[in-house]
């Protein structure tokens, strides 16, 4: 039984598919909030990409010890609109700062149970987990 | 032996840590190229985020059947500079369209070997894999 992704020995517990495959998206711990006040809404001329962007964002740590990876980061937009390329500080209402989402594959640790229902260590269960990756300056949607 | 992340039964193979942990980044299959000609360099007023962005991008599939997740997508910038918010087509040289990179946790399928060197199914080996997530409109770096 080397049927990947069981990740268990072929002479192990053939009735168990220990790495369960479930693709139900898992919501993040907190809703992705816009955070327009905690840090000044400006585009820097140095530093990392998220501070030089005209749709700047910060990262918030989401840690879960029963998940792989245990540390995920959610982007939080610092401005509702894009920052002017000219000044780096004034907002341009012609552009919106929008969160870019991604359903990331993660694995959760779950107790495994054998044929007789007894606890047989831990299995990894695959889930899709929605993370916000970045804030992007976009042209507002024109409704048809 | 329920020492996570072996993901194997506690009465399994205590000498094997079946989910091996190695955090050496793995390069993507192809270098992240800038792709300024394959799609027109413009910001749409509808459609998905990557086409409405003033730093638009397309996605390139990276599939590896021995990796979890098997499908990853790399962003490829369509413009070297940001597109004007006013016109949605002309480029504004005051802004650069830059790739946002992320070291994503992935798992590779590897043959496992028991104490006697015999093949015991498959293990999952954790690696960090660099993916480009999106293209972001940034103010150019001012060198001090």
């Amino acid at each position: 039984y080397s049927h990947w992704p069981s990740c268990c020995p072929s002479k192990g517990y053939p009735s168990e598919e220990l790495l369960r495959w479930s693709t139900v998206p898992v919501p993040p711990l907190k809703p992705a909030s816009l955070d327009f006040h905690s840090v000044s809404c400006r585009a820097s001329e140095d530093g990392p990409l998220n501070s030089r962007a005209i749709s700047p964002w910060r990262y918030e740590l989401d840690r879960d010890l029963n998940r792989l990876p245990q540390d995920l980061y959610h982007a939080r937009c610092l401005c509702p609109h894009c920052v002017s390329l000219q000044t780096g500080s004034h907002m341009d209402p012609r552009g919106n700062s929008e969160l870019l989402y991604h359903n990331q594959t993660v694995f959760y640790r779950r107790p495994c149970h054998g044929k007789k229902g007894n606890h047989k260590g831990y299995c990894l269960e695959r889930r899709l987990y929605r993370v916000s990756l970045a804030c992007v300056c976009v042209r507002p949607r024109v409704m048809g | 032996y329920s020492h996570w992340p072996s993901c194997c039964p506690s009465k399994g193979y205590p000498s094997e840590e079946l989910l091996r942990w190695s955090t050496v980044p793995v390069p993507p299959l192809k270098p992240a190229s800038l792709d300024f000609h394959s799609v027109s360099c413009r910001a749409s007023e509808d459609g998905p985020l990557n086409s409405r962005a003033i730093s638009p991008w397309r996605y390139e599939l990276d599939r590896d059947l021995n990796r979890l997740p098997q499908d990853l997508y790399h962003a490829r910038c369509l413009c070297p500079h940001c597109v004007s918010l006013q016109t949605g087509s002309h480029m504004d040289p005051r802004g650069n369209s830059e790739l946002l990179y992320h070291n994503q946790t992935v798992f590779y399928r590897r043959p496992c070997h028991g104490k006697k060197g015999n093949h015991k199914g498959y293990c999952l080996e954790r690696r960090l894999y660099r993916v480009s997530l999106a293209c972001v409109c940034v103010r150019p770096r001012v060198m001090g």
């Epitope: 998220n50 740590l61 245990q70 540390d71 | 020492h3 942990w21």
Partner: antibody, heavy 122, light 107 residues
Framework: EVQLVESGAEVKKPGASVKVSCKAS????????MNWVRQAPGQRLEWMGL????????SYNQNFKGRVTLTVDTSASTAYLELNSLRSEDTGVYYC???????????????WGQGTLVTVSS | DIQMTQSPSSLSASVGDRVTITCSAS??????LNWYQQKPGKVPKLLIY???SLHSGVPSRFSGSGSGTDFTLTISSLQPEDVATYYC?????????FGQGTKLEIK
């Protein structure tokens, strides 16, 4: 040798702000998250938050009601703690502490700065 | 927040004694518990991580045990240099929380 060196003692008035620095050396600064822990006189240790120098990602103790801001300067391998709207009960020693981890079982503060005494008094 | 409670708050023992300090969590934290030692006027030092793993350089007379909500730090044979305050800390969930500390003295 891993070292965390904090800035000197501060005396502040209620309502003011304080910014404490923590200079790291002897390891890859961006490879480890940095925690900040406070110890008021005769009190237990109190975790304030952490920051990942690699991407600036943070997690804060909400008990500080948004008064804490953590930042880093990776080029100087330095972490900063800023505490606003100071009150007398904020008097104490403020520690930075590097967080070691193995990726699945433990997160532990293995190296600590020498501490910065902040006194809030009118 | 997860509350951590240590007992006793202080204790006095003789050199060579076996000393036990307990730490109780307000909810199950699996084995996600660390112990720190803080000598008078000094900085806290990591002693034990993940309930029972000894940090490098820590003498083998220190050991940790427990799971779920109840944890123990044991010093098998107390030495004069062990005079300190000991803190447990959970890291299952943010915010990290510490016990109130146990002050250990020599009789």
């Amino acid at each position: 040798e891993v070292q965390l060196v904090e800035s000197g003692a501060e005396v502040k008035k209620p309502g003011a702000s304080v910014k404490v620095s923590c200079k790291a050396s002897g390891y890859s600064f961006s490879g480890y998250t940095m925690n900040w822990v406070r110890q008021a006189p005769g009190q237990r240790l109190e975790w304030m938050g952490l920051i990942n120098p690699y991407n600036g990602g943070t997690s804060y103790n909400q008990n500080f009601k948004g008064r804490v801001t953590l930042t880093v300067d990776t080029s100087a391998s330095t972490a900063y703690l800023e505490l606003n709207s100071l009150r007398s009960e904020d008097t104490g020693v403020y520690y930075c502490a590097r967080e070691d981890y193995d990726g699945y079982l433990y997160f532990a503060m293995d190296y600590w700065g020498q501490g910065t005494l902040v006194t809030v008094s009118s | 927040d997860i509350q951590m409670t240590q007992s006793p708050s202080s204790l006095s023992a003789s050199v060579g004694d076996r000393v036990t300090i307990t730490c109780s969590a307000s909810q199950g934290i699996s084995n996600y518990l660390n112990w720190y030692q803080q000598k008078p006027g000094k900085v806290p030092k990591l002693l034990i991580y993940y309930t029972s793993s000894l940090h490098s350089g820590v003498p083998s007379r220190f050991s940790g045990s427990g799971s779920g909500t109840d944890f123990t730090l044991t010093i098998s044979s107390l030495q004069p240099e062990d005079v300190a305050t000991y803190y447990c800390q959970q890291y299952l969930a943010f915010p990290y929380t510490f016990g109130q500390g146990t002050k250990l003295e020599i009789k």
